[in-house]
Interface confidence: low
């Protein structure tokens, strides 16, 4: 509550998280021409990448392009990409939604369809939809282990959300425990009123919020943290602004002296935790 | 404007950007000792980085130094670094601006210089200039997609920049389309007074601003971004203190059984999105 | 000081950190059963990542796991991990603190110990502690620089912390240099009272405060930033609470068509730079 | 491995008390919550109790104020004692034990179980 005698001071704040959890994945692997039903094990080296700060992202869902080279080949058939001579294609064009740069040529993608030949990773990915249910479904009961360490400068205060007389077995409860610095992410989609199954196929952002409201006085003194949840990306958002939250990374290799790649495009959650609060002292 | 009756607080912001367009990259590539022109394509997962938060990197140049292995070899003769004789050498010395740990022998480099010999990744990096004009300078036409979600805790108010009106084919522009939040990168340059194609050379920081002046009040309520771009680098910055913005990463692989590496040094342009403002209410 | 009579504003802020250095290290490498004394380089690629904005990290330590494929083995034998029969082990099970999915049977991890089998990448990390004294334990010479650009908006002030009058070849101290911004690591954890050899060994975070109080008055103006150093991180931390800094990352592969992986557990500093302070101007 | 036996169960009058008790055996230095839930004829397994490692204790709604839950450490025990009882309280109780950090409530967290102890409320 706002004490008007008080001098307020905004919160400095540093933030390290740790996720955990393993995350069994189901997929169609084709290798040879047949395709056959591969099971893999992901773990957080697997899934989520070394980040700094107030953010961290864990992968719920991927498409992969493997084996691609740089070459000529017929770009992707999406909706209004195919051809019927060279005249549609014009050499030196990038479009935007394409994957490469086209040499001009109207060339056979399959056997129904042609489509403009372009410079590029190839073959080029294929624009199929993300897989339903995400592969990394289970990643919903991942736990994160949230420290943040607080100071107000002019008030040389220092403090940190975990005190000693916590333990590391507990798990954040809205009413039950509301301290703990330990939550489960389906916990964190439940309290923001989101499905988490859902998000996890386009991926999106999700926000946690720490609030620090503190009233240094020592004869009223507290200092504690708040947590709140509400996705950050919107749901509703038109296709053109590019939905849920993905990139693409790739790994690069040799094969027979040649630079190949294989490009994931991975979709997840992207968590941000926001800091805020006041330290107030007469 | 300053309304003195109203209870102003900061903006909480989260950020997520998404860059477009590809490059074609013309290079001499030397194999086997012949030299030739060497085209290639790269895309989003070649030139940008996952990042997270309010910053995003567009890589605009590189020098590569292939085939790297640990062993013991001259290092680059830089200015000041020649030898005559083993005296010059200091075994395990670690000259900063060198890649190596002196052996305190002095070996021949090539026909005509001789350096210390050094413990390192070899042969060591040539410090050449970066490639003028830069090999990626046609990122000057990708574009970035920028989504700011913020909120005002304290007056339970969330917005976004971009609104259900909005649509994906709009690009940014002062006058005829300010709440456009997909930017050109030689635009937003261009707004800061910039020359991108310089820029590209060395690499340099960019700072897009997004300012939230926001009445909350319902009877005179506004609450829109505006954006304004500026250079953050110091382009006439001491050599000293390394100018542009360039870092170095390794890609690690196995040859015959022996641990390799390409080093990449990277050159390009970080994006650092600003957001600032406060939202008042009687 | 407080001058009430002016209109304050907070900083807005962009850092940009180069890190110098190079670690000799010295482990025991063991190939085709036998082991030797294996000394390696490392350098910025191999010891720091491509990061953005207030956070840099330096790797100090590390443990490694190489040649790990998925399939199934038996999960590390640690305290209470151990079994006799297939009763203890349940067939899906995911232990936080194993690596894998229990097949739900009871195999020999060596020959004297028994523990459940695990689909995972395999074998299985070993559990063992941080090398001590820390691999990289020399980082604690290597040096930073960092360059601060600051803006008040609403005074239409920008400065930065790197000022023409300096060079690049001071190193920060309290009383003799308290302007230059390239700081040597062990200086920084000095002036915190903390021990970089003893840190290095698990991790840890340091903040280094960057404060600007600005009077931006022409007849008393002064704009310069005050550098301090604290430990972010709880060194007291419960066990359960994950005390230190590590996170793990992967180098994947392919031999004989396999995929592959080097786990590494990757222990060091992260480094939060936190700027902040006001401008105020009458 | 971790065994789990529940005892005190019984008929009772509504407005009646009962106490019941669970001893683990085995790897018990794993465990970090344990609970009890229920399961009336004829309807799912439900939530009534729990406790965390640190002695933070969670209550389902419809039992909050008439039981008190409670643990020893040393001896490996919870117990569970129920006041003012009512005739919907009449049900299979489970104890249940994890050793992971998911929330109290959810059934699926729990690695081990005990064979159930019946406890009928008469009116």
């Known amino acids: 509550s706002d004490k008007l005698y008080q001098r307020k001071e905004p919160v400095i704040s540093s933030v390290h998280t740790k996720v955990k959890g393993i995350a069994e994945v189901t997929e169609n692997v084709t290798e040879g021409g047949v395709t056959k039903l591969g099971h893999s094990i992901f773990d957080t080296a697997d899934y989520t990448f070394p980040l700094q700060g107030n953010s961290f992202f864990v992968m719920t869902n991927y498409v992969k392009s493997e084996g691609q080279v740089q070459t000529l080949c017929p770009e992707y058939p999406r909706r209004g990409a195919q051809c019927s001579s060279d005249r549609r294609c014009k050499k030196g064009w990038m479009d935007p939604q394409s994957k490469g740069i086209q040499t001009g040529r109207c060339v056979p993608y399959d056997k129904t369809r042609k489509t403009c030949e372009v410079s590029a990773w190839c073959p080029t990915e294929e624009e199929k939809e993300a897989p339903r249910p995400a592969l990394l479904r289970s990643a919903e009961n991942f736990t994160v282990l949230i420290k943040n360490n607080i100071h107000f400068p002019g008030h040389n205060y220092t403090t940190r959300n975990i005190l000693p007389t916590m333990n590391g077995s507990c798990t954040f409860h809205k009413t039950w425990d509301p301290q703990c610095s330990i939550f489960r992410l389906g916990d964190i989609f439940q309290e923001a009123g989101e499905n988490f199954t859902e998000v996890a196929v386009q991926g999106g952002i999700m926000g946690i919020e720490i609030y620090w409201d503190c009233n240094l006085d020592s004869w009223s003194h507290h200092c504690r943290p708040r947590y709140s949840f509400r996705r950050l990306d919107d749901k509703n958002m038109d296709e053109s602004f590019v939905p849920g939250y993905n990139f693409r990374y790739a790994k690069y290799y040799k094969e027979n002296n040649v630079e190949k790649r294989t490009l994931i495009k991975a979709f997840g959650i992207r968590f941000d935790i926001l800091v805020f609060g006041t330290g107030g002292k007469f | 404007s300053d309304k003195l009756y109203q209870r102003k607080e900061p903006v909480i912001s989260s950020v997520h950007t998404k860059v477009k367009g590809i490059a074609e990259v013309t290079e001499n590539v030397t194999e086997g000792g012949v030299t030739k022109l060497g085209h290639s394509i790269f895309d989003t997962a070649d030139y940008t980085f996952p990042l997270q938060g309010n910053s995003f990197f567009v890589m605009t140049n590189y020098v590569k130094s292939e085939g790297q292995v640990q062993t013991l070899c001259p290092e680059y003769p830089r200015r000041g670094a020649q030898c005559s004789s083993d005296r010059r050498c200091k075994k395990g010395w670690m000259d900063p601006q060198s890649k190596g740990i002196q052996t305190g022998r002095c070996v021949p480099y090539d026909k005509t210089r001789k350096t210390c010999e050094v413990s390192a990744w070899c042969p060591t990096e040539e410090e050449k200039e970066a490639p003028r004009p830069a090999l990626l300078r046609s990122a000057e036409n990708f574009t970035v997609l920028i989504k700011n979600n913020i909120h005002f805790p304290g007056h339970n108010y969330t917005t976004r920049n971009i609104l259900p009106t909005m649509n994906g084919s709009c690009t940014f522009h002062k006058t005829w389309d300010p709440q456009c939040s997909i930017f050109r990168l030689g635009d937003i340059f261009q707004e800061a007074g910039e020359n991108f194609t310089e820029v590209a050379v060395q690499g340099g920081i960019m700072g897009i601003e997004i300012y939230w002046d926001c009445n909350l009040d319902s009877w005179s309520h506004h609450c829109r971004p505006r954006y304004s771009f500026r250079r953050l680098d110091d382009k006439n910055m001491d050599e000293s203190f390394v100018p542009g913005y360039n870092f170095r990463y390794a890609k690690y692989y196995k040859e015959n059984n022996v641990e390799k590496r390409t080093l990449i040094k990277a050159f390009g342009i970080r994006f650092d999105i600003l957001v600032f403002g406060t939202g008042g209410k009687f | 000081s407080d001058k009430l009579y002016q209109r304050k504003e907070p900083v807005i802020s962009s850092v940009h950190t180069k890190v110098k250095g190079i670690a000799e290290v010295t482990e025991n490498v063991t190939e085709g059963g036998v082991t030797k004394l294996g000394h390696s380089i490392f350098d910025t690629a191999d010891y720091t990542f491509p990061l953005q904005g207030n956070s840099f990290f330096v790797m100090t330590n590390y443990v490694k796991s190489e040649g790990q494929v998925q399939t199934l083995c038996p999960e590390y034998p640690r305290r209470g991990a151990q079994c006799s029969s297939d009763r203890r082990c349940k067939k899906g099970w995911m232990d936080p603190q194993s690596k894998g999915i229990q097949t739900g049977r009871c195999v020999p991890y060596d020959k004297t110990r028994k523990t459940c089998e695990v689909s995972a990448w395999c074998p299985t990390e070993e559990e063992k502690e941080a090398p001590r004294p820390a691999l990289l334990r020399s980082a604690e010479n290597f040096t930073v620089l960092i360059k601060n650009n600051i803006h008040f908006p609403g005074h239409n002030y920008t400065t930065r912390n790197i000022l023409p009058t300096m060079n690049g070849s001071c190193t920060f101290h309290k009383t003799w240099d308290p302007q230059c911004s390239i700081f040597r690591l062990g200086d920084i954890f000095q002036e915190a009272g903390e021990n970089f050899t003893e840190v290095a060994v698990q991790g840890g975070i340091m903040g280094i405060e960057i404060y600007w109080d600005c009077n931006l008055d022409s007849w008393s103006h002064h704009c310069r930033p005050r550098y301090s150093f604290r430990r972010l991180d709880d060194k007291n931390m419960d066990e359960s609470f994950v005390p230190g800094y590590n996170f793990r990352y992967a180098k994947y592969y392919k031999e004989n068509n396999v995929e592959k992986r080097t786990l590494i557990k990757a222990f060091g500093i992260r480094f939060d730079i936190l700027v902040f302070g006001t401008g105020g101007k009458f | 491995e971790v065994q789990l036996v529940e005892s005190g169960g019984g008929l009772v009058q509504a407005g009646g008390s009962l106490r019941l008790s669970c001893v683990a055996s085995g790897r018990t230095f794993s465990i970090l919550t344990m609970g009890w839930f229920r399961q009336a004829p004829g309807k799912e397994r439900e939530f009534v109790a729990a406790i965390s490692g640190i002695g933070a204790i969670h209550y389902a709604d419809s039992v909050k104020g008439r039981f008190t839950l409670s643990r020893d450490n040393a001896r490996n025990t919870v117990s569970l004692h129920m006041n003012s009882l009512k005739p919907e309280d009449t049900a299979v109780y489970y104890c249940?034990?994890?050793?992971?950090?998911?929330?109290?409530?959810?059934?699926?967290?729990?690695?081990?179980w005990g064979q159930g102890t019946q406890v009928t409320v008469s009116s």
């Open positions: 249940a034990a994890k050793a992971n950090y998911e929330s109290p409530s959810r059934e699926t967290s729990y690695a081990y």
